[in-house]
């Protein structure tokens, strides 16, 4: 048995658990999900037994092999998958373990503004980027675009300081997970520093 293989899939998508076997005479192959049998294959009789009806349309073995393709992925398909190859020529089954992480395609991140101070024409505040549905394993970066600077900032919180009379700055939050990325609406420093309460066009 080899090291644990990590796989990533997206909700609604498909993933293939690769299986390469050197075993000559295979009696049966059993795929398991979190200790629950998923599929049993008996190559001799060409029998494939899918344990749960709801998985019947989601399970496939492409190209006539034994690699398992799981379609129409759901969030709760995340977990540990295990395959055992049983053969009379082996003293104990040949095994392989997989960990599947299923991620949602990210929606547009939401930006909120912290307490704002506007002293002597300099506006100081924090912008916080977050996902409304609390998606997992999201990495946030900020892009600051404008004549004054083109730079990136890692993390969900962006501290900003913008002077009246300064070149306009546009801030965009980029949210990423292993399967997708999405962008917040662009936020103009000059509009932000006016205060969203006054600004019907506020991009937040």
């Amino acid at each position: 048995s080899g090291p644990v293989k990590e796989l990533v899939g997206s909700v609604g998508g498909a993933v293939t658990f690769p299986l390469k076997s050197k075993v000559k005479q295979v009696d049966s192959i059993v795929w398991t999900f979190n200790t629950t049998p998923l599929v049993t294959i008996q190559p001799e009789g060409g029998t494939i037994i899918v344990t749960q009806n709801r998985n019947r349309e989601r399970v496939d073995f492409p190209d006539g092999g034994y690699s398992l393709k799981l379609s129409k992925l759901k969030k709760n398909d995340s977990g540990i998958y295990y395959v055992g190859i049983y053969s009379s020529s082996l003293q104990q089954p040949s095994t392989q373990e997989y960990v599947l992480h299923v991620y949602e395609h990210l929606s547009k991140p939401k930006v909120t503004m912290g307490l704002q101070s506007n002293k002597n024409g300099t506006c100081v505040t924090n912008l916080t980027c977050c996902m409304e549905h609390g998606e997992e394993d999201v990495i946030y970066t900020w892009k600051a675009l404008g004549q004054a600077a083109n730079e990136s900032h890692n993390g969900s919180i962006l501290p900003i300081s913008w002077r009246w009379g300064e070149s306009d700055m546009t801030f965009i939050c980029v949210a990423r997970n292993p399967v997708s990325r999405n962008f917040s609406s662009p936020i103009l420093a000059r509009k932000l520093c006016e205060g969203a309460a006054d600004d019907p066009d506020s991009s937040m």
Epitope: Q147, G165, R190, E194, D199
Partner: antibody, heavy 118, light 107 residues
Framework: EVKLVESGGALVKPGGSLKLACAAS????????MSWVRQTPEKRLEWVAT????????YYPDSVRGRFTISRDNARNTLYLQMSSLRSEDTALYYC???????????WGQGTLVTVSA | DIKMTQSPSSMYASLGERVTITCKAS??????LNWFQQRPGKSPKTLIY???RLVDGVPARFSGSGSGQDFSLTITSLEYEDMGIYYC?????????FGAGTKLELK
């Protein structure tokens, strides 16, 4: 083309009041800060007031604070400066000005003359 | 308030000459300074913003430099249309303050 046209300048007695207006066209008026800047007879430029795009924030130097009020009507694309308790040192050519996305005072009107004299 | 001291207050120069005008801030203003030109009978016009950035459409003979407290505007080869008054403006903080101006006249 950005156009700023000031009006309302006049000869006024010390202690009197006056309201200036600036009609704006050719740009998204409600999206930009607007300012008043004056030029004295000695040709000095003095910043007078600034109002933010939605009218929420206003800024003044000490020399006019409490006497002048800047306001705007975004529906009419018009900027105003209400001046009261006028003094001889307020005599100047009053310009309205706005910014572009890169810098302040990118566009200026032609000015309106305010003379405070007995 | 930040005081902007501009010098000289007036100067005479010949066509083709190199001209430098300076502006000194009473405290550190980083690069938060703009330069304006006002031709006779006209409204002021921005030449340079953020101390050294040339406004689109302004001839390349104009340049700005400096940061902190000391700034300068240079015209490499003076032309007739450059006559007028030049002002600096600090926008590091309110109140915004202008220099007193430099009147540039033809020698």
């Amino acid at each position: 083309e950005v156009k700023l046209v000031e009006s309302g300048g006049a000869l006024v007695k010390p202690g009197g009041s006056l309201k200036l207006a600036c009609a704006a066209s050719g740009f998204a008026f409600s999206s930009y800060d607007m300012s008043w800047v004056r030029q004295t007879p000695e040709k000095r430029l003095e910043w007078v007031a600034t109002i933010s795009s939605g009218g929420r924030n206003t800024y003044y130097p000490d020399s006019v604070r409490g006497r002048f009020t800047i306001s705007r009507d975004n529906a009419r694309n018009t900027l105003y400066l209400q001046m009261s308790s006028l003094r001889s040192e307020d005599t100047a050519l009053y310009y309205c000005a706005t910014r572009n996305s890169n810098y302040a005072f990118a566009y200026w009107g032609q000015g309106t003359l305010v003379t405070v004299s007995a | 308030d930040i005081k902007m001291t501009q010098s000289p207050s007036s100067m005479y120069a010949s066509l083709g000459e190199r001209v430098t005008i300076t502006c000194k801030a009473s405290q550190d203003i980083n690069i938060y300074l703009n330069w304006f030109q006002q031709r006779p009978g006209k409204s002021p016009k921005t030449l340079i913003y953020r101390a050294n950035r040339l406004v689109d459409g302004v001839p390349a003979r104009f340049s700005g430099s400096g940061s902190g407290q000391d700034f300068s505007l240079t015209i490499t080869s003076l032309e007739y249309e450059d006559m007028g008054i030049y002002y600096c403006l600090q926008f590091d903080e309110f109140p915004l303050t202008f220099g007193a101006g430099t009147k540039l006249e033809l020698k």
